[in-house]
Amino acid sequence: DWVVAPISVPENGKGPFPQRLNQLKSNKDRDTKIFYSITGPGADSPPEGVFAVEKETGWLLLNKPLDREEIAKYELFGHAVSENGASVEDPMNISIIVTDQNDHKPKFTQDTFRGSVLEGVLPGTSVMQVTATDEDDAIYTYNGVVAYSIHSQEPKDPHDLMFTIHRSTGTISVISSGLDREKVPEYTLTIQATDMDGDGSTTTAVAVVEILDANDNAPMFDPQKYEAHVPENAVGHEVQRLTVTDLDAPNSPAWRATYLIMGGDDGDHFTITTHPESNQGILTTRKGLDFEAKNQHTLYVEVTNEAPFVLKLPTSTATIVVHVEDVNEAPVFVPPSKVVEVQEGIPTGEPVCVYTAEDPDKENQKISYRILRDPAGWLAMDPDSGQVTAVGTLDREDEQFVRNNIYEVMVLAMDNGSPPTTGTGTLLLTLIDVNDHGPVPEPRQITICNQSPVRQVLNITDKDLSPHTSPFQAQLTDDSDIYWTAEVNEEGDTVVLSLKKFLKQDTYDVHLSLSDHGNKEQLTVIRATVCDCHGHVETCPGPWKGG
């Protein structure tokens, strides 16, 4: 039959070449002389000349060694023709299968592999996968079947078999318990890939396994007991820095400390924060401490981490004994601002009030007093008793020193501590009005015509307060009523001055007496310029000159 079974040829053959592989034979050769030829890739097309055929015998020849990894199968066609070149057979399929030799070593896809696994994980936890390839056949032979193994582990702590590698997948897993980042933070494994399923050629690579941190170490106070001294009243004062050690990875949430005051801070006087770099607990005063109330505080502070513990761990507690140091505290006026009502104009030497301070310190310290600010110089203060007396005339109507009836004085108290301290108080004297000012007309100069004169309206002002003001009364004195009249309007706050008899042009004094509701009388002289004119005038007209 004009058929040939697939031909198997091992790669890397030694020869000699050409090497006879198989004979093509047509049974038509009994009738006529047959000539054989082959075509196809490897014969007459690239790669040309790998195979040939003996023209007359039909022997298929191999001309050189084959490489399965280059071409694993050749598909050729065999031809048979008679002497005259006519085909005597249909072209025949010739399959040449190149069989594998173990001529390649495995190759890792990387020279160094990197992976990581959390410390403390259970055996069986997968870490990473490594891969090696082998160009040889792994389907029909074991030449390309790679088996993985761990050649060595560095370091060998806690023992030399912390990891295993799946021989066929290359998956590296934890095989032993005891991965502890704080003892061994990284392992270097020398891994092997061996073909022939572990019985052939070997290649090596490195697998670096980083052990990742878990919060398996509690922060511990070192030391656990502290003594601190804090001056009383200091707010935001650094009391103590508490130091902790934590074996977990620095600057990670498993290392960063969180502090909590567990006890001893009944008045909420303290606060504790974590220093971002040193991880220390910084204990500070949130409120001022009072030596006289409590001179020692014993605080209990617990430390944990930002991250939760991965297992049950005992927490560390520190004890801080805070000694409050006595400070010479300033005397405090009671109240800090004192309002006292006092009549204006009280006699010199008259007592105004007693204004004293208390010293928070427990010792019987002597307090002395003095006036710190008395703008008008109206007051004096007894240095021992704090008695404030008038030494000048308190004038409610003094606009330079009195605002809204209040005269403000600052007083000082000084103790005899070492060094002495001072406190200030504010004395607000509310000056009660006295009818010490009579009414005053405005304006006090008028110009009026001596013919058909216009009535002159004068406003009445009184520096005192009601009821020592309107309604006002007016009266002309010193014979001024011969030529003038003075009447207060219905509201009682203006006076109307009228010329009732002819006066020649000149300047005259009008004696006007005004009294207020409390009968406080004030005599005012009005300068009246009388002009030769009719009705309304502002200035007297000059003398008329004819031409």
């Epitope: 990387q110 020279d111 582990q153 560095e154 370091p155 270097t188 690579a205 980083e210």
Partner: antibody, heavy 123, light 113 residues
């Protein structure tokens, strides 16, 4: 002060052997990986081998199977046993300390180097 | 093996001028987990051993003048000398330590113009 001092270099015939030493001082020798690096005359640097703290090793393919790195922590000394020497092995051989213990702290960078010892392979 | 290629092979720079040396790796030296580039730079003066200048591609070794700086990531890296001094005449090498075997660039010779 960290110091590394190589010795053992010299003239050797092709196929011959030589053992280089590197005496270390000024640091905790046992705590650091140590490397051998060579430099052929007028050429660049070629890394040869490392020995890690636990004694594990790694080699460049050019010397694998011919050179062996070892250390004696009790003597603070590093060694390089060189067999089957070839003309192309002629170079100045340096020992160099890794700046870190672990891969993640940069053990591949070498922060201290010895002055080197010259090995000449010639017939 | 990872191949390291430096450019240029040599360069001449005037005193006080900037010098830039490039280094290219055949594969990435960036490890994604820690975002670090496993690359170092060395200086070797005539007759002396190499001296470490930069590690992690940009971290200056203690005692190295701040005119030396490293930059780059992945496969492309640069050593810059901001103001070249006479004492900077040397051969500069980059080295990868991402993967064994560690490999160096062929070196760049710096001269004064």
């Amino acid at each position: 002060e960290v110091q590394l001092l190589e010795s053992g270099g010299g003239l050797v015939q092709p196929g011959g052997s030589l053992r280089l030493s590197c005496a270390a001082s000024g640091f905790s020798f046992s705590s650091y990986p140590i490397n051998w690096v060579r430099q052929a005359p007028g050429k660049g640097l070629e890394w040869l081998s490392v020995i890690w703290t636990g004694g594990g090793t790694n080699y460049a393919s050019s010397v694998k199977g011919r050179f062996t790195i070892s250390r004696d922590n009790s003597k603070n000394t590093l060694y390089l046993q060189m067999n089957s020497l070839r003309a192309e092995d002629t170079a100045v051989y340096y020992c160099a300390k890794s700046r870190g213990v672990y891969d993640f702290d940069g053990r591949g960078a070498m922060d201290y180097w010895g002055q080197g010892t010259l090995v000449t392979v010639s017939s | 093996d990872i191949v390291m290629t430096q450019s240029p092979d040599s360069l001449a720079v005037s005193l006080g001028e900037r010098a830039t040396i490039n280094c290219k790796s055949s594969q990435s030296l960036l490890y994604s987990s820690n975002q670090k580039n496993y690359l170092a730079w060395y200086q070797q003066k005539p007759g002396q051993p190499p001296k470490l200048l930069i590690y992690w591609a940009s971290t200056r070794e203690s005692g190295v003048p701040d005119r030396f700086s490293g930059s780059g990531s992945g496969t492309d890296f640069t050593l810059t000398i901001s103001s070249v001094q006479a004492e900077d005449v040397a051969v500069y090498y980059c080295q990868q330590y991402y993967s064994y075997p560690y490999t160096f660039g062929q070196g760049t010779k710096l001269e004064i113009k």
